[in-house]
Every structure is written in C-alpha cells, then in structure tokens.
C-alpha cells in the first residue's frame, strides 16, 4: 500500500507478487463521501503506471486489467480529478514481478584448514527479481544437522561456523541448499563429502633453508604444516626465471632435501599441502622464501687474448685481456684474477692478483719464450688456469687468412668473412676475430674485443660493443700450434657522409711542389670508416672547376704532396673526406702561392 489511502483503496488480484507474464486486475475505489463535491458522476478516477496515465473512469470505482509487466517492481497510483481542481492522490500499490528460483547448481563446500569452518558456495541461477531466502542444510552421521539462512538478495555463500573433525575422517556429511520465494522453491542436488574431501589445508608456514657445511649439494628445506598433511608440492626457481621446478613429496614431515640447486643463485621457494593422495584439494602456495645458495669454486676456463706492442730494440709490451666467466661458471663473486707470467727456458715466473679489471699490461724482454696463465678465484677456490704461449701473432705470412671482408649486417652487427690461408688450411686450429674502435693515434687504451671461431668456419658475426657510425679495425688471426698469421680490414655497422672535412694545418713548399698537412677528423665526426681524402684546389678568383687529387685513406697518414701547381699563382685549397655513404662538407680553405720558377 502506498500513502495513507484515506480517500480510497487500490486492490490487486490475484496478488501483489506475480509470475512474469501473468495478468493482474487493479481496482481503485473511493470511500464514501470522498468524491468530488455534490456530483459523483463528476468523479474522474485516473490510474497511473509510474507517471504515465494508463486508464480513467467516471464514477466511484475503476477496474483495469494489466498485462506485460516487466521483471521488477511497478508502481501504480490512482488519482481523482474534479472540475477546476488539481488531481488528488487516492491510493497506490506496488506489484512485484519475478520468477520462482531455479535449482541452485554446483554446490561445493570447503573448510580452510583443519580448524577452519565449513563454508559452501553455489550458483543461484537467473535472478528471481524477488525477495528470495536461501537455507543451507548440513547433515552428518547419527542424524546431526545444522542449518543456516541467508536473506541477502544475492546470496550464494554461507558459512556454517562449525569445523569437521579429523577424528573420523571417513564420516559422510551432506549439504543441500534450498531457495524459497513467493512463487516457489527449489533445492540443489545434495553434495556429500568427508573431512578429507573438503578440508583445504592452510598453506605451509615458517619456511627455512639450511646448507650443511655451506655446500649447495647439502641443502634441506624445512617448513611447518598442519598435523594431517600427507602430501607436499614444492616449487622453486631462480629469482630471474619464470619457469618453476616442481617436486611432489609424500610424508615429508616438514623437510625435504634438494639436490639440483645451482651455486650462488637466488632462488624463490614455495610449498603447498594436501591431506590425501586423491581426495581434497591443495592448499594455496605458501609465502615465498627467497634465499641465495652458497658459492662453489669456479668451473670452466677464462677466454684469454693478448696484444703485443714493440717498444724498442729490447723491450715489448704485452697486454692481456680476458672475458668474465658466465654466472654459471663463476659460481660465486669473483674476488680476483691470478695472472702468472713465466719465461719458459729460464723458469722465471711472476704472479699477480688483479682485482676489478679484466686486463693487465706489462713490459717484458723481447728475448726468451714467454707464457701466461690466468685463473679466476672466488671465496671457494679458483678456476683451472688458461695457459697461453706468447708468440708473434702475425709472423707466419702463409697462415694469414685471405680475402677478408667486413659488411654491415643489420643494426649494430658486422659480418666478417675470409678465406682460409694458402698454407694447408687443415693446419688451422682456430680463428680469432678481434676488433677495436679505430683511433688514429693507435691508442692502446681502447677496449679490445674478440671471439673465437672453429677452424672450419669462414665467417663470424660480431655484435658485442659495436656502435653505429664508428669505424672498427678488424683483424682475423689464424692460429696453428705456436704460429699465427693475420689479416686486417676496417669495417662499420652503419655509416653516413662525414660531418666535416679535414682541417689543413700547414702547406709547405718543397722543390717546386707543395706538401699539405692536415689534422684528422675527430672520430665522432667521421661517421664510419673513411675510404678516401680529397684535396681540391683552384686559382683564386677563378670560376673554373677545381682540380682534385684523391688519396686512399690510411690511418697514420696526415700529409700529401701535390706537384701540379703553377708558380706565382695564388691557389685556394681545401679537403673533404669520404665514407661509402658519401663526401663530407669542405674543411677549412687555405691560400697558397708557389714561389718557385715556372717550368
């Protein structure tokens, strides 16, 4: 009923709650002496559905048959209209349209932990649009029963507040949920289970790891579980990995030995529990334990390379380079590298520990046979030493690789190719491809890169420390026993025309010709490997085309003679540089007048 309804009544038949698709009869009737003043036939009763007029009638009552009402609540209001006055509200009624509840589906119950409480969930089915009450019933052995009711409009979960006991894990319990509203009722199929079926253990806690004698091979994982746990799943992975290793264990009783962990690796460990081999469900995964495994002595051997540089008639500089061991080979934090230098005939040896660097430079006599050994040490020991006999790597001309080429291969890669040496190619034990940024001064501090290639390979893709628009000096060594041969080439991964031309710093006259000297283009402006320099000249104030001389680029060259200038003529000279991509802009212009006699 809506409002006080002092002036009349609205009745609804068959009921205020109806099944979707049903018809209702709505009657609005005035109480005695509540109509318009004097004339009853002047009473105009109007029926509204919400705020829309759907019917009217003159008299004391109005009947209306309504069909097609939508799901949910519809409000009907009856009003009285008299001549020369506003409509007066008489009474109203709400009609509730819905459906009987569907059979609840997929009833399932769970108890979280041995001491948790039994809670059940189900699917309600389609919305009834009506007030619907759900009753969950649990019956156990010996006529034990519990009931819980839920009056929430969207009820699909109830907790009984009791826990099943492990004392009789085989005892059967049956749950059933019944939905009731004004239009009908429906019960789920019963769900029968035992303690073991529905108890989902709490995840294990207090997870710890112990390494006996600080060794990764003696590792035990410990944890605490609820008392009835029979099965555990362990999963673990290196912290930087997405893939888990899985182990299933039975009757572990809170401990398990792990045999396949890698040294010096941070791992993440998680454990899950289950009460029975084929009944019940797994617990959630435990919180993660993160732990680093202990170090073990390094495995593998360092990749060592070297460079020799002539200093004077009696001395040579040896620069040793080595690559870091991989994480799996280092098996710990490398504390230092041990370098041993030995003269093989006289037996003299010196050992040095190098910290924080992967290179070492020393000066040794040019005489004698020298060898080096390099190893890496962590807190547990040292790797096997890599031994190298120091030799002249390019001495054997017949071992020099032939037809060496270097071509750009995609972004920041250079493909180096070669042909085997003329000397019996089967004598080659390995090739070493070495590259470093080209610095005109031949700077020995420039980092050296290298890779080793098997003797049957005739190409190598170099990508480590390769930058765009930088020229690299690339050498290919063929090694055979205590001999080596080498060939070199310049290469870049990406190039464009140089940003500037060379700067002419001096022009000098020598016996009727001139010698032009220039400063090298700064490395960052070369934009790749230079192929040529061009020297241009023309008579001052002349509109004629300049003459030019093209000089192949050589790293150390920074001067060149020109002998085709006329005496006592003032010339303007400038230079450009070229890469495979094109020519630079002009360098500076210099004027020069040759003083010598005319030919």
């Amino acid at each position: 009923k809506i409002d006080a309804c002092k002036r009349g009544d609205v009745t609804v038949k068959p009921s205020h709650v109806i099944l979707l698709g049903s018809t209702v009869n709505i009657t609005c009737s005035l109480k005695p002496r509540q109509g318009c003043f004097h004339y009853s036939r002047r009473n105009k009763l109007i029926l509204y559905k919400f705020d829309r007029r759907i019917n009217f009638h003159h008299g004391h009552s109005l009947n209306s048959q309504v069909t097609g009402l939508p799901l949910g609540t519809t409000l009907f209001v009856c009003k009285l209209a008299c001549i020369n006055s506003d409509e007066i509200q008489i009474c109203g009624a709400e009609i509730f349209v819905g459906v009987a509840p569907e059979q609840p589906q997929n009833l399932s119950c769970i108890q979280k932990g041995e001491q948790g409480t039994v809670a059940c969930t189900w699917e309600r089915g389609r919305d009834t649009h009506l007030y619907t009450e759900y009753t969950l019933q649990l019956s156990g052995p010996k006529n034990l029963t519990w009931q819980k009711q839920c009056k929430d409009i969207y009820c699909d979960y109830l907790d009984f507040g009791i826990n099943l006991t492990p004392e009789s894990p085989e005892s059967n319990f049956t749950a059933k949920v019944t939905a009731v509203n004004s239009l009908g009722s429906s019960s789920s199929l019963p769900s029968t289970f035992t303690f073991l079926d529905i108890v989902r253990p709490l995840p294990p806690w207090d997870i710890r790891i112990k390494f006996q004698k600080a060794s990764v091979s003696r590792c035990t994982l410990y944890w605490r579980d609820e008392g009835l746990v029979l099965l555990n799943r362990l999963r673990y992975r290196p912290s930087n990995s997405r893939l888990w290793n899985m182990v299933n264990v039975t009757k572990a009783k809170g401990r398990h030995d792990l045999l396949d962990l890698k040294p010096f690796t941070e791992y993440e460990f998680q454990i899950s529990s289950k009460l029975h081999l084929y009944k019940g469900s797994w617990s959630d995964w435990s919180e993660s334990l993160r732990a680093q495994t202990p170090e073990e002595e390094p495995t593998g051997m360092l990749d060592v390379w070297y460079m020799k540089r002539h200093i004077d008639y009696s001395r040579q500089q040896i620069s040793l380079f080595w690559k870091n061991l991989s994480v799996s080979e280092a098996r710990g934090k490398i504390l230092h590298y041990q370098v041993t230098l030995q003269e093989l005939t006289g037996g003299k040896a010196m050992t040095q520990n190098i910290t924080g660097h992967t290179s070492w430079t020393t000066v040794i006599p040019r005489t004698g046979n020298w060898a080096v050994a390099v190893s890496a040490a962590n807190s547990k020991g040292s790797s096997l030493p890599t031994r190298i006999n120091i030799m002249n790597l390019c001495e054997a001309g017949l071992l020099a690789p032939r037809q060496v080429s270097a071509n750009s291969e995609g972004m920041d890669n250079i493909l180096v190719t070669w042909q085997p040496p003329r000397k019996d190619p089967s004598a080659v034990q390995e090739y070493v491809v070495e590259w470093r940024e080209l610095h005109p001064g031949g700077d020995t501090q420039v980092p050296l890169n290298w890779l080793r290639s098997r003797p049957y390979n005739v190409s190598a893709l170099i990508s480590e420390n390769i930058k765009s628009y930088i020229c690299y000096e690339i050498r290919v060594y063929a090694l055979s026993g205590d001999q080596g041969g080498c060939s070199s080439i310049l290469g870049n991964s990406k190039h464009k025309a140089p940003l500037s031309g060379p700067h002419i710093n001096a022009i000098t006259e020598e016996k009727g010709s001139i010698l032009i000297s220039w400063n090298s283009i700064p490395v960052q402006e070369q934009m790749g490997c230079l192929l040529h320099y061009r020297i241009y000249w023309k008579e001052r104030d002349s509109n004629s085309q300049p003459q030019l001389c093209e000089i192949p680029y050589r790293v150390s060259q920074n001067s060149h003679p020109i002998n085709s200038l006329q005496p006592r003529v003032t010339y303007v000279l400038w230079m450009t540089a070229l890469t495979a991509a094109g020519e630079s802009s002009h360098g500076n212009e210099r004027e020069f007048c040759l003083q010598g006699k005319a030919n």
Epitope: K142, L144, N163, T165, E167, S168, P169, E170, G227, L230
Partner: antibody, heavy 116, light 107 residues
Framework: EVLLVESGGGLVKPGGSLRLSCAAS????????MNWVRQAPGKGLEWVSS????????HYADSVRGRFTISRDNAKNSLYLQMNSLRAEDTAVYYC?????????WGQGTLVTVSS | DIQMTQSPSSVSASVGDRVTITCRAS??????LAWYQQKPGKAPKPLIY???SLQSGVPSRFSGSGSGTDFTLTISSLQPEDFATYYC?????????FGGGTKVEIK
C-alpha cells in the same frame, strides 16, 4: 550387532613385546577409523593410537610414539597394536574403539601387565 | 595438545537429583566433545556426541550443551543406575584427550 573383541594381553617383562588384536563384526570395518584406548588400574582413560579406514592416517600419543605400532587388515576385519620396549607404566586395560564423532563402540578390554 | 579439565572430580547426590558436570577445553574445540559413562570393571559407554546429540539407546534424562571451550553434561533426575564415573573427550584434533573424570556417588 556391532561387536569388538580384544585379545593378546598378558604378563610381560619390562623391555618385552606384545601384540594385541581386535576382531570386529556387525559393521563395515573398512569404512571406519579405529582406535586403542587404555586405562591404568584406578586411573582415567588415555587415548593411545588411531588409524584411518585405509591406513593413510596414523596418530600416536607422545607416551607411546616410537614403541607402539598400530595396523589393520580390512580383509580380516582386524585391528592390531604391536607393543615393543614395554615399561611398567604401560600396565593397563587396553580397549579397542570405533570412531564416529567420538568413540561410539568399545570392546570389553584386555589386560596388559608389565612387571619383572 | 588440548587439555580437558573436568569439574567437580566427584559429586554426592541422591536419586531424583539434578546433576551437572562441566568440562573445559584449553582451546576452542567447536562442538566436538563426547561424554562417556563407566562403571567399575566395564568398558566405557558412549552417552553424547557432538556436544549435545544423544547416542541411540541413551535415556533422555541425559543432555549435553556448550561449544567452543565450555561444555556441560546434565542428568535431570538421577536414577540408581546412573551412579558411575563420567568422562568428557575432545574429538576436535589429535592427540585426542580425555578429562580426568567425575565420580557420581550416592549421598
């Protein structure tokens, strides 16, 4: 009618062994957990051990763990308690009992006396 | 382990009296408590399971109540055959434990 009958009790010296048996009838033995409960002369009841229907779950009181072993043979409808390293304080009447939300059926008991 | 404490340890009463025995658990045990009656030289007889449910064949003068930690066994009108020792037992978790017993004697 549910019936549980214990046997195997007797006099034994400290450090000795005994094996108790419980013969069950009148119910589906393989569907129930079974227990041993004991009562020392003039004392209260003390739970000793439990075994689940398919022997997956076995529990012992701290006082007997490591010395007593519970087992069952569902084909023979029988429950057993192997008692080793017996002590004077193990002297008691030993009952076998069925589990169903408590101990709902008990045997008549068998007396075990440990004395030198 | 869950300790079960029964009180009183003994009670003297007459036929027709109402007798109440209490049992307290050291931690919550939900409703998983059983009561037993034992007469000298006999095996215990189950009376009540799940705190308040009567085992079949047990007279209705026996009733149980409580949940969590506090439980009560009530004999509404004591009969001559009720003079015995009564034990409570928790069936909530292992190890299963009994109360110390309450002896009901004739006054």
């Amino acid at each position: 009618e549910v019936l549980l009958v214990e046997s195997g009790g007797g006099l034994v010296k400290p450090g000795g062994s005994l094996r108790l048996s419980c013969a069950a009838s009148g119910f589906t033995f393989s569907s129930y957990s079974m227990n041993w409960v004991r009562q020392a002369p003039g004392k209260g009841l003390e739970w000793v051990s439990s075994i689940s229907s398919s022997s997956d779950y076995i529990h012992y009181a701290d006082s007997v763990r490591g010395r007593f072993t519970i087992s069952r043979d569902n084909a023979k409808n029988s429950l057993y308690l192997q008692m080793n390293s017996l002590r004077a304080e193990d002297t008691a009447v030993y009952y076998c009992a069925r589990s169903e939300l408590g101990f709902d059926y008990w045997g008549q008991g068998t007396l075990v006396t440990v004395s030198s | 382990d869950i300790q079960m404490t029964q009180s009183p340890s003994s009670v003297s009463a007459s036929v027709g009296d109402r007798v109440t025995i209490t049992c307290r658990a050291s931690q919550g045990i939900s409703i998983w408590l059983a009561w037993y009656q034992q007469k000298p030289g006999k095996a215990p007889k189950p009376l009540i399971y799940a705190a308040s449910s009567l085992q079949s064949g047990v007279p209705s003068r026996f009733s149980g109540s409580g949940s969590g930690t506090d439980f009560t066994l009530t004999i509404s009108s004591l009969q001559p055959e009720d003079f015995a020792t009564y034990y409570c037992q928790q069936a909530n978790s292992f190890p299963l434990t009994f109360g110390g017993g309450t002896k009901v004697e004739i006054k």
